[in-house]
Amino acid sequence: LPEMAQPVDPAHNVSRLHRLPRDCQELFQVGERQSGLFEIQPQGSPPFLVNCKMTSDGGWTVIQRRHDGSVDFNRPWEAYKAGFGDPHGEFWLGLEKVHSITGDRNSRLAVQLRDWDGNAELLQFSVHLGGEDTAYSLQLTAPVAGQLGATTVPPSGLSVPFSTWDQDHDLRRDKNCAKSLSGGWWFGTCSHSNLNGQYFRSIPQQRQKLKKGIFWKTWRGRYYPLQATTMLIQPMAAEAAS
């Protein structure tokens, strides 16, 4: 199966009369209603493969999926930048690809969480994702939708850079969150969320181990390793972010 990081074979030439869709939302806008894998080509980017989820709210690009621990998410900066995993299973699309989709537009970020009892939570944020020059900073541009309200972090307006164990951009001076936890994430103070943490099929006894797991503090708590997560993004209409 192709790795998410692999570009499409450049030998395939797009016709002079046609082009690849820019993103999943454009596919939805031209009438596509089938979810699945599509080749897209955002402006100025090489083509790449994405998972599109078509819903009543339009077309969403899946940027992260966890559900079985089959893929190691404790990877360095370059891996998180390029993307990794299996498009049919667990994967991280890649920060550069996500940024090529969103450009300078504000976007909706949907976060789907599931615990081991079958309970699910859907959160929606209005966000702006910066480029590599900002360490792919994620800024909440509006309050979140969903049960958890504004208790989710980062707070509106705060911009949080992405961090990995080899590129520490978190908001703590005394600690490397990615190193002491696991995986790459928009770490603020290490304790609010980490959907790219270590996958635990059973809850470890030691809290030291447990803190490395996949968690969303304001939902099931800091030390509850979640069973499944999906992150989806959808750029908003044309006007640029302020």
């Epitope: 395939h12 030439n13 797009v14 016709s15 002079r16 009369l17 046609h18 082009r19 690849l20 869709p21 454009e26 596919l27 031209v30 009438g31 596509e32 089938q34 979810s35 699945g36 894998l37 599509f38 080749e39 493969l49 994405v50 998972n51 498009p87």
Partner: nanobody
Framework: EVQLVESGGGLVQAGGSLRLSCAAS????????TGWYRQAPGKQRELVAS???????TYADSVKGRFTISRDNAKNTVHLQMHSLKPEDTAVYFC??????????????WGQGTQVTVSS
């Protein structure tokens, strides 16, 4: 404009197999979905199978496990392998492709169709 030309239809006995091919006049790489539809006499055209540019497959319930769609970007062709054919599979089979133009408009292309007749 992309021209789609179907081939491989014919008369076959129930339980037999056929392989339909759809050749495109230019690169199918930019066709985000390609598929096969069929229309039996007096009935509406219905989706048989489709494949996205990334390889995701959709099949009509009536053909699941019997038909397989595939796409060859290098040869600009789409195939429909049909096994365990039944009389109710008798129809004209049409190739379909959908794309976005450089003018940002959606385009839908259809072939002329190829007749498949399954005798009992």
């Amino acid at each position: 404009e992309v021209q789609l030309v179907e081939s491989g239809g014919g008369l076959v006995q129930a339980g037999g197999s056929l392989r339909l091919s759809c050749a495109a006049s230019e690169s199918i790489f930019s066709l985000y979905v390609t598929g096969w539809y069929r229309q039996a006499p007096g009935k509406q055209r219905e989706l048989v199978a489709s494949i996205t540019s990334g390889g995701s497959l959709t099949y009509a319930d009536s053909v699941k496990g019997r038909f397989t769609i595939s796409r060859d970007n290098a040869k600009n062709t789409v195939h429909l392998q049909m096994h365990s054919l039944k009389p109710e599979d008798t129809a004209v089979y049409f190739c379909n492709g959908r794309s976005i133009g450089v003018d940002d408009m959606p385009y839908v292309y259809w072939g002329q169709g190829t007749q498949v007749t399954v005798s009992s």
